[in-house]
Interface confidence: low
């Protein structure tokens, strides 16, 4: 359909309220350091001038692109240069290539404090002004993190408001309130590095990429829906996710409500665990569909040999449709194998590709390809003697331990990278065993799998902005499939050279003794990532003492009557005490 | 707001040593890109180092490589810059500035900084 008015017709698709909560977002991925009430004041102005072209789709400016409108925006802000600095020559910039400037200036580390939760605090906000607090919720989540799923964040901001309804009525307000705001936090920041990763994806690799990643994906989930039903949902899905990891959030919503409204109406053919989903309001229904339980699968599945190796005519299936026959396959295999990590059936498709591009051109193709199955045990014994290993290894140690040995490793193999990433990063990795290691056999290849290339996004995601290591830069841009391997197979970096020990790394103060634990764990894990700097070749045992003076040092100086005191005098002694130990 | 104030400036002979400092209030610093400038007089501010927010990355001006090292403290809040080997050519007011939003020093244009200190005063003579 053309429309004389993009933004009237969005605007009338998607409702007042949705409308302003995305434009909210747009503007706060952006402008992530502006004020909640400098972009209440934008959302007013688009949302009166979107209400004009409602009314008048031949009124002034009603014709321009989005793009256009948000743009100028976003450049008729006096301050722009004062705060966002060199964002502000993308002003100099035309339509689409200014789009594609902001773009590239979205920060995925921004430079926010951490939201601390006060449950009276919040109550009286909430009870004060609903709508306020709503969109104020949007925007602190959309500024941390730009590439938010837009309509995924509009769910998340109504059971929000919906948590804050119950508890604000308590009498234990923060009893009932923490625990329900740290699961949603839990959910919401696995949220974000899923899109995250899905925009990396199509940003870096390309929209075939993501189609393959969503295609393996979506055959495991809904086994029963014939290959051009996934194939369909897989297009839309795919223009989608691209329209909102390009900031075009109102489009994004409104297509993804379109794409809900299909699979709801074709349910039939696609799962029978839609049902529920089906029946819940469009915010609900999206999300239960994204989320929704694995169908089961058909009885009577073909073994996929009979059409990927003994079949006469691969080669020609191959060489006339080479994207479709390689996606029959990926679709075959994956609905297969609900067990199997997306990144290892992309493996797997990758493989039998390979070999089909070389058999194909031998003069007895058949007897080439015949064992092609068989190259497909190694791709899958490699994670699942890794998961086998750690999951035991996180037994052993329990999660904090685990997360140190996780340090440990990826220090030697990366020295070069930032403390605070190499921190960030192990701490995500090591959380692969209390999510994974407990479930069942068959879905912890998948759970730990697909969770590792998140939190390696997210390394490759902070990497790319600061490039420091070669090695990094090569897993992250070779292979999206393949970076969990090609980390899992990287070796202590011998040609690092140790970094000076500088004392203040290892000073602290009494702070720490009112930090809670996680915090307190992460200053530990610093200062053990700073000593690996140092000393790469440390010992296990050596910095096991290290870690266990230090405990000793701190739990001494938090029960003294002056902690201050107590770390100006024993912490010289402790860095002496290190300075001996890895001597 | 964010609040910059340097210290630790003075007279110094050639071939001296001197380490300057530059406490932050209204914001952590090291969750933000700050650099040092300078300014000889009749002359624009000129880049001497920076380090990235939560990402432990140095950048410096050639014509300092090998004699200044920039480093912060940050339960303190404070960044330094520890001066050796100076030279008369090293004399100029010594100002730190922040981007805030800005986690790594992606410049070293003293116009895309906001905030600023007062400055201190650096005189390389004998």
């Known amino acids: 359909d053309t429309y004389k008015s993009e933004i009237a017709h969005r605007f009338k698709d998607l409702g007042e309220q949705y409308f302003k909560g995305l434009v909210l977002i747009a503007f706060s991925q952006h402008l992530q350091q502006c004020p909640y009430e400098e972009h209440v004041k934008l959302v007013r102005e688009v949302t009166e001038f979107a209400k004009t072209c409602v009314a008048d789709e031949s009124a002034e400016n009603c014709d321009k692109s989005i793009h256009t409108l948000f743009g100028d925006k976003l450049c008729a802000i006096p301050s722009l240069r004062e705060h966002y600095g060199d964002l502000a020559d993308c002003c100099e910039k035309e339509e689409p290539e200014r789009n594609e400037c902001f773009l590239q200036h979205k920060n995925d580390n921004p430079d926010i404090p951490k939201l601390k939760p006060d449950p009276v605090a919040l109550c009286a906000d909430f009870q004060e002004d609903e709508q306020k607090f709503w969109g104020k919720y949007l925007y602190e989540i959309a500024r941390r993190h730009p590439y938010f799923y837009a309509p995924e964040l509009l769910y998340y901001a109504i059971i929000y408001k919906d948590v804050f309804s119950e508890c604000c009525q308590a009498a234990d307000k923060a009893a009932c309130l923490l625990p329900k705001i740290e699961h949603l936090r839990e959910k919401v920041l696995t949220s974000a590095a899923k899109q995250r990763l899905k925009c990396a994806s199509i940003q870096k690799f390309g929209e075939r990429a993501f189609k393959a990643w969503s295609l393996a994906r979506l055959s495991q989930r809904f086994p029963k829906a014939d290959f051009t039903e996934i194939s369909k949902i897989v297009t839309d899905l795919a223009k989608v996710h691209k329209e909102c990891c390009h900031g075009d959030l109102l489009e994004c919503a409104d297509d993804r409500a379109d794409l809900a409204k299909y699979i709801c109406e074709n349910q039939d053919t696609i799962s029978t665990k839609l049902k529920e989903c089906c029946d819940k309001p469009l915010l609900e229904k999206s999300h239960c569909i994204a989320e929704a339980k694995r169908d089961e699968l058909p009885a009577d599945l073909n073994p996929l040999e009979h059409d990927f190796v003994e079949d006469k005519e691969v080669c020609k299936n191959y060489k006339e449709a080479k994207h479709v026959f390689l996606g029959t396959f990926l679709y075959e295999y994956s609905r297969r194998h609900p067990d199997y990590s997306v990144s290892l059936l992309l493996r797997i498709a990758k493989i039998y590709e390979a070999t089909l591009e070389d058999c194909c051109a031998k003069e007895d193709p058949p007897a080439c390809y015949a064992t092609v199955f068989d190259k497909f045990q190694p791709l899958v014994d490699e994670p699942k003697n890794l998961i086998k290993q750690n999951c035991e290894l996180f037994e052993k140690l329990g999660e904090y331990g685990f997360q140190n040995a996780l340090i440990v490793r990826y220090t030697k193999k990366v020295p070069q990278v930032s403390t605070p990433t190499l921190v960030e990063v192990a701490r995500k990795l090591g959380l692969v065993g209390s999510r994974c290691c407990k479930r069942p056999e068959e879905e912890r290849l998948s759970c730990a799998e697909d969770y590792l290339s998140l939190v390696l996004n997210r390394l490759c995601v902070l990497h790319e902005k600061t490039p420091v290591s070669e090695k990094v830069t090569k897993c992250c841009t070779e292979s999206l499939v393949n970076r969990r391997p090609c980390f899992s197979a990287l070796t202590p970096d011998e040609t690092y050279k140790p970094k000076e020990f500088v004392e203040g790394t290892f000073t602290f103060h009494a702070d720490l003794c009112t930090l809670p634990e996680d915090e307190k764990q992460i200053k530990k894990q610093t200062a053990l990532v700073e000593l690996l700097k140092h000393k790469p070749h440390a010992t296990e045992e050596q910095l096991r003492t290290v870690l266990g003076n230090f405990a000793a040092f701190v739990q001494k100086c938090c029960a003294a009557p002056d902690h201050e005191a107590c770390f100006a005098v024993e912490g010289p002694k402790f860095v002496i005490e290190i300075r001996g130990i890895l001597a | 707001e964010v609040q910059l104030l340097e210290s630790g400036g003075g007279l110094v002979q050639p071939g001296g040593s001197l380490r300057l400092s530059c406490a932050a209030s209204?914001?952590?610093?090291?969750?933000?890109?700050v650099a040092w400038f300078r300014q000889a007089p009749g002359k624009g501010r000129e880049f001497v180092a920076g380090i990235g927010g939560g990402v432990d990355i140095t950048y410096y001006a050639d014509s300092v490589k090998g004699r200044f090292t920039i480093s912060r403290d940050n339960s303190k809040n404070t960044l330094y810059l520890q001066m050796n080997s100076l030279r008369p050519e090293d004399t100029a007011v010594y100002y730190c500035g922040t981007r805030p939003g800005r986690p790594l020093i992606t410049s070293k244009v003293a116009d895309l900084y906001p905030y600023w200190g007062q400055g201190t005063l650096v005189t390389v003579s004998s």
């Open positions: 209204g914001r952590y610093i090291d969750e933000t890109a």
